[in-house]
């Protein structure tokens, strides 16, 4: 079991890249229009 997990990390990936891929939708949405889907579109004054 442990060997399998270790090998998967050695396969040209790092924990950081895995975390980037698996970043939560909530966190990912913060990089764009954060209120989209909660208060409607727009955002301009």
């Amino acid at each position: 079991k442990h060997k399998c997990f270790r090998n998967s990390l050695e396969n040209n990936e790092t924990l950081e890249s895995i975390m980037n891929t698996l970043e939560s939708e909530e966190d990912f949405r913060k990089y764009f229009y954060y209120l989209e889907g909660s208060k409607g579109g727009g955002g301009s004054k």
């Epitope: 980037n20 891929t21 970043e23 939708e25 966190d27 913060k30 990089y31 764009f32 229009y33 954060y34 209120l35 989209e36 579109g41 955002g43 301009s44 004054k45």
Partner: antibody, heavy 118, light 112 residues
């Protein structure tokens, strides 16, 4: 109108530092993630870094990780890019872009040119 | 990293005729929320990029309906139904599904 305006570019020697600014107006700056994208002379576009709407989350391209730092001041509607240990390959036009609806870069500035040369 | 490729890299077109640009990603751009975050940008000579299309096929505000986007998964297309002189420039596809965000190499559109 909705716009972003970059400033702070110039000619700098390798190894030195530079800080770029991006002033936003016409929209609620604190509701949007903001990005920096660069374009080397005659080349294509390269995404550099992003900061979340509240400044709590950041992400960087491998090419600038550990050298560049993105930050923002929502009270001043301004985005920053601190560039340290500059290299010749960092020479580019640097654009500030808004992360808009649909996870797209919907507003772009005119850019500010950074030239790293001895 | 997701690699974006475009074909053709250069496209001489006749005014009033259609034009088509293809974009392919090295892996699926479908995100866990079910959306596909593929956009198209136009960069006219000497100008900054401008958003044309987001989420494959949605035209950004102010973009003429001559521009349309289509595709799914890893294969996408930008079409200009009737090319105008104003359309000259470089067109980029871009993915914002996964970090690091990446662009295609660009397709240069000019008039024959």
């Amino acid at each position: 109108q909705v716009q972003v305006v970059e400033s702070g570019g110039g000619v700098v020697q390798p190894g030195r530092s530079l800080r770029l600014s991006c002033a936003a107006s016409g929209f609620t700056f604190s509701n949007y993630g903001m990005h920096w994208v660069r374009q080397a002379p005659g080349k294509g576009l390269e995404w550099v870094t992003v900061i979340s709407y509240d400044g709590s989350n950041k992400n960087y391209a491998d090419s600038v990780k550990g050298r560049f730092t993105i930050s923002r001041d929502n009270s001043k509607n301004t985005l920053y890019l601190q560039m340290n240990s500059l290299r010749a390959e960092d020479t580019a036009m640097y654009y500030c872009a808004r992360g808009g609806s649909g996870f797209a870069f919907d507003i772009w500035g005119q850019g500010t040119m950074v030239t790293v040369s001895s | 990293d997701i690699v974006m490729t475009q074909t053709p890299l250069s496209s001489p077109v006749t005014l009033g005729q259609p034009a088509s640009i293809s974009c392919r990603s090295s892996q699926s751009l479908v995100r866990s929320d079910g959306n596909t975050y593929l956009s198209w940008l136009q960069q006219r000579p000497g100008q900054p990029p401008r958003l044309l299309i987001y989420k494959i096929s949605n035209r950004f505000s102010g973009v003429p309906d001559r521009f349309s986007g289509s595709g799914a998964g890893t294969d996408f297309t930008l079409k200009i139904s009737r090319v105008e002189a104003d359309d000259v420039g470089v067109y980029y596809c871009m993915q914002t599904t996964q970090f690091p965000f990446t662009f295609g190499p660009g397709t240069k559109v000019d008039i024959k």
